[in-house]
Amino acid sequence: KNLKSPQKVEVDIIDDNFILRWNRSDESVGNVTFSFDYQKTGMDNWIKLSGCQNITSTKCNFSSLKLNVYEEIKLRIRAEKENTSSWYEVDSFTPFRKAQIGPPEVHLEAEDKAIVIHISPGTKDSVMWALDGLSFTYSLVIWKNSSGVEERIENIYSRHKIYKLSPETTYCLKVKAALLTSWKIGVYSPVHCIKTTVENELPPPENIEVSVQNQNYVLKWDYTYANMTFQVQWLHAFLKRNPGNHLYKWKQIPDCENVKTTQCVFPQNVFQKGIYLLRVQASDGNNTSFWSEEIKFDTEIQAFLLPPVFNIRSLSDSFHIYIGAPKQSGNTPVIQDYPLIYEIIFWENTSNAERKIIEKKTDVTVPNLKPLTVYCVKARAHTMDEKLNKSSVFSDAVCEKTKPGNTSK
């Protein structure tokens, strides 16, 4: 009896694991083995596929084969007993294109109201992702073990901290990787659960802000209790994106170690140009708080986020405001190559009742004004990155009178 070729060959590639699966074409024939050959692009000869010779099952692993993952290969399979079947040729494929990203490795650390998630690729030093290792982003699904209501968090890096959780509560999460450059979405990790700790008697400091005074940075924060000491630490922000880094070596700001006020002042030259993360911790001598939420601090934005300059065109029932780049000394405009959001405050000159408009655009309409009335306007710029949390000071107020009625066109 002629042996039939195996059918329906599937190639599964997850990270650096290459698995072949196929169907027996004739279940009634016993003691059949299967063998594969492969052929690289531009070659005529077929080579025996190591790891996939004389296989008795319908699955084999050819991960040990050192392939160029960007090069197309072809496979063929046959059945063998006393004689052999004809070869069944599998559609050619490029390993990289076919590969899926495996589940990442996840480590969790719990605080009372936060969880720190450390994520790394599931396959260390992967050949498949060797050129893309730095491009991985991750997304996760988190839920309270007791409720099961899921929250999704997209586009995170190898270390992520989730805040505003409840103490002594078990949270579960799963993480998957993505390579957006290659349109690849990975497989979820197993579910990891962790219980947040008992609530710390000392809350972390809040509302951290940095401003510039003379040649110094002034760091301020809020705290619930008096008679505390505080310390401030910094970290290069880019380290958060480094997938190989699992140890974050936060450094003390010398002038902000054991300070007894809710602010500290340190020279601008402590930091070279760059983006940093800052965090603050409180202590009463016996107990220590968890660290505050980390704020992003960009030395360039910090130094140069100036109030916007604007012109007003007055109509009878509205102002049209045109926002321009702020001016440096010497009247040259400052180029701010990061997205800003503008906060415009306006009020009737004879009243204290302020109204506010928040706009991304640089031309803004202030509606519903009364004719022949003097209104004053001031504006400030905010960075759109919530973690930078940086605002300019307000511009000087500009006051203008609206036109008489029926000039709104």
Epitope: H107, L108, E109, A110, E111, D112, V116, H118, R159, T197, V198, N200, G244, N245, H246, L247, Y248, K249, K251, N286, N287, T288, F290
Partner: antibody, heavy 119, light 107 residues
Framework: EAQLQQSGAELVKPGASVKLSCTAS????????IHWVNQRTEQGLEWIGR????????KYAPKFQGKATMTADTSSNTAYLQLSSLTSEDTAVYYC????????????WGQGTSVTVSS | DIQMTQSSSSFSVSLGDRVTITCKAS??????LAWYQQKPGNAPRLLIS???SLETGVPSRFSGSGSGKDYTLSITSLQTEDVATYYC?????????FGGGTKLEMK
């Protein structure tokens, strides 16, 4: 595989100094903290301090301030512990250990260096 | 400094026993606790970090639990190779401190 190799046993006289070494393989000490721990005969473990090899920043247990000095040379992937003004109380095994991840602890240990202070 | 107390300095044990070793901190250490195993003549070996996370390669008969100031290392069914001294260590405070150790000895 991450490993730490420590220098050989030392027999030193009271009042003298000694410098112990700890060489890493399988990882870069710049990416870790290196801790030093000692253990006197039949006693428990005692933390001496830690160094960040990347910038030389150190932290010492109060008891070892002035007694121990930690340094590191990233070019040779080696950390050092210098002990000064030695007395018989300093006779112990000294271990180096690496700390490679926030979520872990002292995950790799050297085999230990025995220091005997005797006249 | 945070003091770490291991109440029993030694334990007599038999093969197959369930063993529980306790460790108490002088203040809340919020699960920043590691357990190490040390056999005579050898360097310590990390078993558990974060109070409960088992290190890769550590047998599943070992487990860690606890919170606040009180922590426990459990061995479900003691094997010959588990006879050693066990140390806890806190890392909530950067002046790291070890417990005095608990030695397991065969009856």
């Amino acid at each position: 595989e991450a490993q730490l190799q420590q220098s050989g046993a030392e027999l030193v006289k009271p009042g003298a100094s000694v410098k112990l070494s700890c060489t890493a393989s399988g990882f870069n000490i710049r990416d870790s903290y290196i801790h030093w721990v000692n253990q006197r005969t039949e006693q428990g473990l005692e933390w001496i301090g830690r160094i960040d090899p990347e910038d030389g920043e150190t932290k010492y247990a109060p008891k070892f301030q002035g007694k121990a000095t930690m340094t590191a040379d990233t070019s040779s992937n080696t950390a050092y512990l210098q002990l000064s003004s030695l007395t018989s109380e300093d006779t112990a095994v000294y271990y180096c250990a690496s700390w490679l991840a926030d979520y872990s602890a002292m995950d790799n240990w050297g085999q230990g260096t025995s220091v005997t202070v005797s006249s | 400094d945070i003091q770490m107390t291991q109440s029993s300095s030694s334990f007599s044990v038999s093969l197959g026993d369930r063993v529980t070793i306790t460790c108490k901190a002088s203040e809340d250490i919020y699960n920043r606790l590691a357990w190490y195993q040390q056999k005579p003549g050898n360097a310590p070996r990390l078993l558990i970090s974060g109070a409960t996370s088992l290190e890769t390669g550590v047998p599943s008969r070992f487990s860690g639990s606890g919170s606040g100031k009180d922590y426990t290392l459990s061995i479900t069914s003691l094997q010959t190779e588990d006879v050693a001294t066990y140390y806890c260590q806190q890392y909530w405070n950067t002046l790291y401190t070890f417990g005095g150790g608990t030695k397991l000895e065969m009856k």
